[in-house]
């Protein structure tokens, strides 16, 4: 066959679908690789062809569109399963071609099983809710296009294994779930099961997402430097190891980049000749507030080093702060025979 622009196996789009449920999979060519849409391609005389490679096989084979009840069908740029079977797992290829043009891409499709509590190997999207922030809502995801707007599906929400008849502050509102005041206890996996009729059959769509309750922007503050502070003086003799921790608290802020860095005499440690190492550790609270600690370490400090300015800096979307560490050279303890005796007027 003549040359075809082959975009290879698009592993970025690892598509996972539940067994025995409808699935509609759009050809990724039009979404991510080509600059035109299916309608344009179709009106230009291009044809979309689908084929697949079964799991653990190398042989590409055409998709059987003549299964009973049209179990697999194609509609425009969408491949439909009504419903999926476990052995539909494999790599699927959509190819757009005519006599002079050809472009194709493959993508992996995994049909996964779930248990009665909706546990499965499915990768779950995470939805963050602000703690005690007033009414917030989540929407049953990825159900568009499965049924026309004239069809009114029934939607049942679950938290973990339990049907949400009403969890008091968690209220099912059809396709949406309202959290009156989100609390830490609302953390968990939420599943919506959408049931709809089609051609005398009943189909179910199961969608699970993880809810994580995080710090509210109402409570967010600029970074707080706990260390260094005015109460601790780093007093060292030359030759000793100097260790200064910079510990900074960051309120949770959606999409904020939290940064901590040291300057020595106004320069980044990388830009000076001192043999300095910096180790960072990060911990999170239950609401994803963050504490970052950067320990500045000089193995064998010199008297010059002890005269330098060591400043810890921190920045988030809420602002920037800095704090200097109090570093000084330890005054050697007096030797009794000479210094102390002189002090008493001995000759």
């Amino acid at each position: 066959s003549e040359r075809c622009d082959d975009w290879g196996l698009d592993t970025m789009r690892q598509i996972q679908v539940f067994e025995d449920e409808p699935a509609r999979i759009k050809c990724p060519l039009f979404e991510h690789f080509l600059k035109f849409n299916y309608s344009t391609a179709h009106s230009a005389g291009l044809t979309l062809i689908w084929y697949w490679t079964r799991q653990d096989r190398d042989l590409e084979e055409p998709i059987n569109f003549r299964l009973p009840e049209n179990r697999i069908s194609k509609e425009k740029d969408v491949l439909w399963f009504r419903p999926t079977l476990l052995n539909d797992t494999g790599n699927y290829t959509c190819m757009l071609r005519n006599t002079t043009y050809c472009s194709k891409v493959a993508f992996p499709l995994e049909v996964v099983q779930k248990d009665s509590c909706f546990n499965s190997p499915m990768k779950l999207p995470v939805h963050k809710l602000y703690i005690e922030y007033g009414i917030q809502r989540i929407t049953c995801p990825n159900v568009d296009g499965y049924f026309p707007s004239s069809v009114k599906p029934t939607i049942t929400w679950y938290m973990g294994c339990y049907k949400i008849q009403n969890f008091n502050n968690v209220i099912p509102e059809g396709m949406n779930l309202s959290f009156l005041i989100a609390l830490i206890s609302n953390n968990g996996n939420y599943t919506c099961v959408v049931t709809y009729p089609e051609n005398g059959r009943t189909f179910h769509l199961t969608r699970t997402l993880t809810v994580k309750v995080v710090g509210s922007p109402k409570n967010a503050v600029p970074p707080v430097i706990h260390s260094p502070n005015d109460h601790v003086v780093y007093e060292k003799e030359p030759g000793e190891e100097l260790l200064i921790p910079c510990t900074v608290y960051f309120s949770f802020l959606m999409d904020s980049r939290n940064e901590v860095w040291w300057t020595i005499d106004g320069k980044k440690p990388d830009d000076i000749t001192i043999d300095v190492t910096i180790n960072e550790s990060i911990s999170h609270s239950r609401t994803e507030d963050e504490t970052r600690t950067q320990i500045l370490s000089i193995k064998k400090v010199t008297s010059e080093d002890l005269k330098r300015s060591y400043v810890c800096h921190a920045r988030s979307a809420k602002g920037e702060v800095a704090k200097a560490a109090k570093v000084k050279q330890k005054v050697p303890a007096p030797r009794y025979t000479v210094e102390l005796a002189c002090g008493f007027g001995a000759t």
Epitope: G134, N166, F167, E173, G174, L180, I181
Partner: antibody
Framework: QIQLVQSGPELKKPGETVKISCKAS????????MHWVKQAPEKGLKWMGW????????TYADDFKGRFAFSLETSASTAYLQINNLKNEDTATYFC??????????WGQGTLVTVSA | DIVMTQAAFSNPVTLGTSASISCRSS???????????LYWYLQKPGQSPQLLIY???NLASGVPDRFSSSGSGTDFTLRISRVEAEDVGVYYC?????????FGSGTKLEIK
Amino acid sequence: QIQLVQSGPELKKPGETVKISCKASGYTFTDYSMHWVKQAPEKGLKWMGWINTETGEPTYADDFKGRFAFSLETSASTAYLQINNLKNEDTATYFCARGSFPWFTYWGQGTLVTVSA
Amino acid sequence: DIVMTQAAFSNPVTLGTSASISCRSSKSLLHSNGITYLYWYLQKPGQSPQLLIYQMSNLASGVPDRFSSSGSGTDFTLRISRVEAEDVGVYYCAQNLELPFTFGSGTKLEIK
């Protein structure tokens, strides 16, 4: 069937305390939050807040923080609204309403509280 | 807080004709999920409020289909196609997009 039955009218003096009740029946009381709504004479409706009937945790609208308290007697499937240090402007009908979708489908019949010296 | 604004009285209507009641919110009630969190309640004389419409255009259970509602994110209209004597009362719009939930001041439906 689902019902919310409130206690009878109250006549109180300024500075006194009133406690009105809302008894629920026909459903599991702890499954649904209970909300309170104030309606002053010839005035509109004002949402006062709600109580989580599972945990007993109240949430008050800003105008109702301080002298107002929501409480529960779960064993009796009853929610209470207590108003301390009554003022003339507390004269109103107070409604309880069940928090569920679609919102406030079930209301109590209302309790008229009259504050007068 | 979101402020809901209503006229105190409707234009007087004749029984059997249609009536419209308006409501405006100080902020769009259209959520990113596509739902408009606007509700209509009717309070008949001496009674508790009753839910008529939820999420802008959905008829509550048991409400006759003479009632309908439409609107944008901030401007809403409740329409009664053939007014009956039992429709008399005060109509409140309300929002539950955000806490605190807020109600309009109410519009009294007047019959000629």
